[in-house]
Amino acid sequence: CDLPQTHSLGHRRTMMLLAQMRRISLFSCLKDRHDFRFPQEEFDGNQFQKAEAISVLHEVIQQTFNLFSTKDSSVAWDERLLDKLYTELYQQLNDLEACVMQEVWVGGTPLMNEDSILAVRKYFQRITLYLTEKKYSPCAWEVVRAEIMRSFSSSRNLQERLRRKE
């Protein structure tokens, strides 16, 4: 399955939107910094079957969508930018969804990389617990916004490697 060029553009637009969403300086939130232990190894490996890699990317975007779809999120961010973010993420999910399904039917059901999916889920669990702990403060959301940008940057690299494999 070839990810459409629009997927790359959508990814870039998502990064831009996340940057635009910034409401306060990260420097004023230094005391709230946190290591969420991004599972970098799940994005570095060349050991991935293509279907597995696409599933991992899908999980990152799906969890990001869910994170920013909460009531607490709608209070924290500019509604207009949030709506644009939802649209971008939704489109990317659709692109990846079609690819996952195509990979499934081309080669029978490939083995789901369970540990990679779980690693991504745990990473977002750490983010969720951090926000809860910090009572969804503006600084906590700013730290999370910056972290999600970092994770999208890493997933972009995985997408580029996928494209080179095609």
Epitope: L118, K122, F124, T128
Partner: antibody, heavy 119, light 108 residues
Framework: QVQLVQSGAEVKKPGASVKVSCKAS????????MHWVRQAPGQGLEWMGE????????IYNENFKSRVTMTRDTSTSTVYMELSSLRSEDTAVYYC????????????WGQGTLVTVSS | EIVLTQSPATLSLSPGERATLSCSAG???????LYWYQQKPGQAPRLLIY???NLASGIPARFSGSGSGTDFTLTISSLEPEDFAVYYC?????????FGQGTKLEIK
């Protein structure tokens, strides 16, 4: 509000298959993995596996891998769990439970479907 | 597979008393992925505590959770009549996800 409504009780003969449904409402169906958990009479809970309704990929408990199939129908926001080669030990209440994170993990359950396997 | 062993299997106490339920894991479980559920006869399980020590929405403050590594505890500070039920610990730290066999809390 989030609701998971399961299909009714079933009685099956050993060797047959059963297909239990779980209809979701009150949230975006494709955004959350759906899990299946079973409970034999007077026993504890046993996780069977999960399905991502968005693309249909599944992760199964090895104990059920050869006999279980989880599918979904996005047009009706319904997930299905089919268990084949039934034996008497499969007599249990089967629950669907929605995934999520933090306080949302297994925060929503179906009402349960009793499957009785008897000759 | 991470085996969760709950003790005691049955706990007989009176309303107003303090209940301490244990959950022991066969191998280490990150506290973020250890949950507790309550189940009453004929009902689906209900989330009580998430990530070892956080109260789920609508759960009274008499419930609390603690622990780390392989030993986790659910405490009910002063039992109310509606607390008599079966309690399960659950982990999703690694596949396959598992539950303890349950502790039945009954009225003495």
């Amino acid at each position: 509000q989030v609701q998971l409504v399961q299909s009714g009780a079933e009685v099956k003969k050993p060797g047959a298959s059963v297909k239990v449904s779980c209809k979701a409402s009150g949230y975006t169906f494709t955004n959350y993995w759906m899990h299946w958990v079973r409970q034999a009479p007077g026993q504890g809970l046993e996780w069977m596996g999960e399905i991502n309704p968005s693309h249909g990929r599944t992760i199964y408990n090895e104990n059920f891998k050869s006999r279980v199939t989880m599918t979904r129908d996005t047009s009706t926001s319904t997930v299905y769990m089919e268990l084949s080669s039934l034996r008497s030990e499969d007599t249990a209440v089967y629950y669907c439970a929605r995934g999520g994170l933090g306080p949302a993990w297994f925060a929503y359950w179906g009402q349960g479907t009793l499957v009785t396997v008897s000759s | 597979e991470i085996v969760l062993t709950q003790s005691p299997a049955t706990l007989s106490l009176s309303p107003g008393e303090r209940a301490t339920l244990s959950c022991s894991a066969g191998s280490s479980v990150d506290s973020s992925y250890l949950y507790w559920y309550q189940q009453k006869p004929g009902q689906a399980p209900r989330l009580l505590i998430y990530s070892t020590s956080n109260l789920a929405s609508g759960i009274p403050a008499r419930f609390s959770g603690s622990g780390s590594g392989t030993d986790f505890t659910l405490t009910i500070s002063s039992l109310e009549p509606e607390d008599f039920a079966v309690y399960y610990c659950h982990q999703w730290s690694s596949y396959p996800f598992t539950f303890g066999q349950g502790t039945k809390l009954e009225i003495k």
